[in-house]
C-alpha cells in the first residue's frame, strides 16, 4: 500500500490515500479549522474504503496531539447494521459526532472551546466484523482557537534591597501585547517575556522596579480586543513594609 498526501487546492483538503490494485482507503480533512474560545467548532473528516457495503461493527475515534498514539478525546461504536454510533468517550462531554460513520463521515463538533483545545486532531475508523481493517488520518486537522486577551494574574512582589516589582500575565490568541502604565511610567512595554513553552498562549510582562507609590495598570491587547487590570502600591514610608 502507498500513503501519500495530496493537497487539493480547490477544497483545501488533505487527502491521504492508502491503495493497492484491489483496494483503496482515503481520508479527507482540512488542514486547519479556526474558531473563537467559547464557541463551537466542527472538525470535518470523511473517508472512502475498499470494503463495499460493509455493515459490520465499527468504531470512530478522534485523538489529539499525534496520530496513532495521542490521547483519545472521542470514541463511539456502532453495532452491526446500526447507524447509531454510541458514544463511549467524550472528553469533558464537549465532543459530539456530527457525521454518520456508515456514510463515511466522522465529522466532530467541539463545544465550549478553550485555548487548551488548540491542537492537531486525528480521525480514525475501525471495522471489526468479517472485515478486519482500520485507517487513521496521518496529517490531521489543526484546530486554531482564537481568544480576546484575558489577564490571568497581576501582582506586586518583593525584590532584593526592599524594592518591589510587578508582574502581569495574560492569555490570548494571537498572543497579546502587554503594556504597563503608572506613576512616572507613561506607557511601557516593560520586559515582556515571550510565551513560555507548554504555555503558548500566555505572555508575561514585568516591571522590574516600582519607584513610586500609586496605581499600576497592565493592558493586554490583540486583534480581538483588550483587557486591563490594576494593582496599587503603597509603601509605609520610614518602614520596610508595603501595602498592595
Amino acid at each position: 500500500f502507498v500513503r501519500t498526501k495530496i493537497d487539493t487546492t480547490e477544497n483545501l483538503l488533505n487527502t491521504e490515500v492508502h491503495s493497492s490494485p484491489a483496494q483503496r482507503w482515503s481520508m479527507q480533512v482540512p488542514p486547519e479549522v479556526s474558531a473563537e474560545a467559547g464557541d463551537a467548532a466542527v472538525l470535518p473528516c470523511t473517508f472512502t474504503h475498499p470494503h463495499r457495503h460493509y455493515d459490520g461493527p465499527l468504531t470512530a475515534i478522534w485523538r489529539a496531539g499525534e496520530p496513532y498514539a495521542g490521547p483519545q478525546v472521542f470514541r463511539c461504536a456502532a453495532a452491526r447494521g446500526s447507524e447509531l454510533c454510541q458514544t463511549a468517550l467524550s472528553l469533558h462531554g464537549r465532543f459530539r459526532l456530527l457525521g454518520n460513520p456508515r456514510r463515511n463521515d466522522l465529522s466532530l463538533r467541539v463545544e465550549r472551546l478553550a485555548l487548551a483545545d488548540d491542537r492537531r486532531y486525528f480521525c480514525r475508523v475501525e471495522f471489526a466484523g468479517d472485515v478486519h481493517d482500520r485507517y487513521e488520518s496521518r496529517h490531521g486537522v489543526r484546530l486554531h482557537v482564537t481568544a480576546a486577551p484575558r489577564i490571568v494574574n497581576i501582582s506586586v512582589l518583593p525584590s532584593p534591597a526592599h524594592a518591589f516589582r510587578a508582574l502581569c500575565t495574560a492569555e490570548g490568541e494571537p498572543p497579546p501585547a502587554l503594556a504597563w502604565s503608572g506613576p512616572a511610567l507613561g506607557n511601557s512595554l516593560a520586559a515582556v517575556r515571550s510565551p513560555r513553552e507548554g504555555h503558548g498562549h500566555l505572555v508575561t510582562a514585568e516591571l522590574p522596579a516600582l519607584t513610586h507609590d500609586g496605581r499600576y495598570t497592565c493592558t493586554a491587547a490583540n486583534s480581538l480586543g483588550r483587557s486591563e487590570a490594576s494593582v496599587y502600591l503603597f509603601r509605609f514610608h520610614g518602614a520596610s513594609g508595603a501595602s498592595t
Epitope: 500500500f1 496513532y68 498514539a69 471489526a128
Partner: antibody, heavy 122, light 107 residues
Framework: EVQLLESGGGLVQPGGSLRLSCAAS????????MSWVRQAPGKGLEWVST????????YYADSVKGRFTISRDNSKNTLYLQMNSLRAEDTAVYYC???????????????WGQGTMVTVSS | DIQMTQSPSSVSASVGDRVTITCRAS??????LAWYQQKPGKAPKLLIY???YIHSGVPSRFSGSGSGTDFTLTISSLQPEDFATYYC?????????FGQGTKLEIK
Amino acid sequence: EVQLLESGGGLVQPGGSLRLSCAASGFTFSSYAMSWVRQAPGKGLEWVSTITGGGESTYYADSVKGRFTISRDNSKNTLYLQMNSLRAEDTAVYYCAKAIGSSWYSDAFDLWGQGTMVTVSS
Amino acid sequence: DIQMTQSPSSVSASVGDRVTITCRASQDISSWLAWYQQKPGKAPKLLIYVASYIHSGVPSRFSGSGSGTDFTLTISSLQPEDFATYYCQQSYSIPYTFGQGTKLEIK
C-alpha cells in the same frame, strides 16, 4: 505510575490448568485492547491472544485456540488468561501488553508487564 | 498467516556505528509494523510503531522506514545501551506475528 503487573505463573503438569492475571494501573484500562504475548526459553516472541477494550471480541493464536480463554474485568482493571489442557510447548514467559491507541486494535504494544513464567512439566 | 523475516539474525557492531536491520513481510502489510528492543531477562520495549513513528522516550537515533513488504530499523550511532535483541511485528492482521529477532552484539 503507568504499569502492568502479571501474576499466576508457576509449575504445572501436562493437561493441567493455570490462570494468569495482569493488574493495570495509570491509564484508562477499558479504552485499550489488551493482549498476551509469550516467549519460550531462548526463543522469540509469539502473540497468544487479544481482547478488545470492552471485551466484545477475543482473538487467539491457532496454537492455543480452544484451550486458552482471555477475559478482562474493567471494574478491577485486570486482564486474565485461563489456560487449560496445558502442554510442554506452552512453557514460556507470558507477558501482558497494552495496545497503543485503540480499544479494538493493537497497532503496537506500547506497555508490557514484567512477565510471569509458566512451566509445564511432569 | 503473515510471516515476518528479519535479517540479519545477528550483527556485530561497535559504539558509534550505524546499524540497519531489515524486516520483510510475506504479504503487503501497508505501514502496520512495529519494532521492539529486548534485553535479557526483561520485557520488550516499543521503539517504532506504524513503520516510522518513534515511541515517546525513545532516542532519536532510532528510526524506522518502509511500507508494503519491506521495512528497516536504523540506529544512526550505536550507544552501549543499544546492544540487545530487536524484533519486528506486523499488526496488519490477526494472528499478529513477530520476526525471529536480530541480536545486536558488541564487536
